[in-house]
């Protein structure tokens, strides 16, 4: 039995997979910040995780997916204050009892040091200094990502 969050996540990812062959993105759109081969959009408003996921989808993007600790640190360096939290594309899958990225892959336990519980209705946020498990209903900011070409495969991280 999938939770509503898992269903929403899977639906959005399936719709994204159908469009992976659209023309590549050469430059970041206005208001988006380039970080290596990605464009990031840091929201100024707040939403629960589900709404944040949907907002990124409407922007033809996804909630942020983080490959490794190095990418995490570079992303955190763009956060201007320690009291700002941002949703990323990682939440707890109750059916698989594991942290799961919205592209379907599971978290490599070495990648992120998560502070907080791994349990139902938990989603992952990042701050300037840490990675937190928060209740998915919490209204905080979020980060969307678009990939720059030549990356044309599915969004990472790979499992």
């Amino acid at each position: 039995q999938k939770s509503s969050i898992e269903k929403c996540s899977v639906d959005i990812q399936q719709s994204r997979n159908k469009t992976t062959e659209r023309p590549g993105l050469l430059n970041c759109p206005i208001y988006w910040q380039q970080l290596r081969e990605k464009c990031l959009l840091f929201s100024h408003t707040v939403n629960p995780w589900n709404n944040s996921l949907a907002d990124c989808s409407t922007k033809e993007s996804s909630l942020l997916l983080i490959r490794d600790k190095d990418e995490l640190i570079h992303t955190q360096n763009l956060i201007r204050d320690k009291a700002i939290l941002f949703w990323i594309g990682l939440n707890f899958s109750l059916s698989e009892k594991n942290w799961k990225w919205i592209n379907g892959s599971f978290l490599n336990s070495n990648d992120l040091e998560i502070r907080g519980d791994a349990k139902e209705n938990s989603c992952i946020s990042i701050s300037q200094t840490s990675v937190y498990s928060e209740y998915c209903s919490t209204e905080i900011r979020w980060i969307c990502q678009k990939e720059l070409t030549p990356v044309r495969n599915k969004v990472y991280p790979d499992s």
């Epitope: 100024h44 707040v46 201007r80 939290l85 840490s130 937190y132 498990s133 928060e134 209740y135 919490t138």
Partner: antibody, heavy 119, light 107 residues
Framework: EVQLVESGGGLVQPGGSLRLSCAAS????????MSWVRQAPGKGLEWVSA????????YYADSVKGRFTISRDNSKNTLYLQMNSLRAEDTAVYYC????????????WGQGTLVTVSS | DIQMTQSPSSLSASVGDRVTITCRAS??????LNWYQQKPGKAPKLLIY???SLQSGVPSRFSGSGSGTDFTLTISSLQPEDLATYYC?????????FGQGTKVEIK
């Protein structure tokens, strides 16, 4: 109806300790950051500390850092402020308020509890 | 830390008057500015958030404007129950800071 009710204030000697509590009801407590704000007699408002919904993340004003500890028990819908090494300048009405992540406003406040630090 | 400066520190006006309180930040805070009302012996109450958004249940005679460093709270027609101290607050960065307050009295 959202309600925040503080308790635990009182008279304490300089160097002493006190623990304030804030009982919350009428909303999903664990989904909200919470803060403590204080007001010295006849003075303005001063933000003291904030804690994230899960309790994993905490922030403090420089004036209380290392002396005060904010915490929460989501199973009891209660916010706490442990105050150690109290000083005369900590004398104030202490309010708990809903909010604390940037850019939250404090949309609900408790009625306040008076802490007096005096010998 | 971001300093918030309100003016005037107090004012006296008649019922029905238009009242304006200003708040200046020591650096740009975009629109991350809130206004609170505190009546004597009571807890503060949120009036305006994000510089110009009226909090639910607050009378429409209250309005806010501004962005960057200069902000204004306006009471379009002062009522007896508006006797209070008004505070601005920035939520752009920690530590969260308040203005020193503006005390509004009724003539």
């Amino acid at each position: 109806e959202v309600q925040l009710v503080e308790s635990g204030g009182g008279l304490v000697q300089p160097g002493g300790s006190l623990r304030l509590s804030c009982a919350a009801s009428g909303f999903t407590f664990s989904s909200y950051a919470m803060s403590w704000v204080r007001q010295a007699p006849g003075k303005g408002l001063e933000w003291v500390s904030a804690i994230s919904g899960s309790g994993g993340s905490t922030y403090y004003a420089d004036s209380v850092k290392g002396r005060f500890t904010i915490s929460r028990d989501n199973s009891k819908n209660t916010l706490y402020l442990q105050m150690n090494s109290l000083r005369a300048e900590d004398t104030a009405v202490y309010y708990c308020a809903r909010g604390g992540y940037l850019p939250d406003a404090f949309d609900y406040w408790g009625q306040g509890t008076l802490v007096t630090v005096s010998s | 830390d971001i300093q918030m400066t309100q003016s005037p520190s107090s004012l006296s006006a008649s019922v029905g008057d238009r009242v304006t309180i200003t708040c200046r930040a020591s650096q740009s805070i975009s629109s991350y500015l809130n206004w609170y009302q505190q009546k004597p012996g009571k807890a503060p109450k949120l009036l305006i958030y994000a510089a110009s958004s009226l909090q639910s249940g607050v009378p429409s005679r209250f309005s806010g404007s501004g962005s960057g460093t200069d902000f204004t709270l306006t009471i379009s027609s002062l009522q007896p129950e508006d006797l209070a101290t008004y505070y601005c607050q920035q939520t752009y960065s920690t530590p969260l800071t308040f203005g020193q307050g503006t005390k509004v009295e009724i003539k």
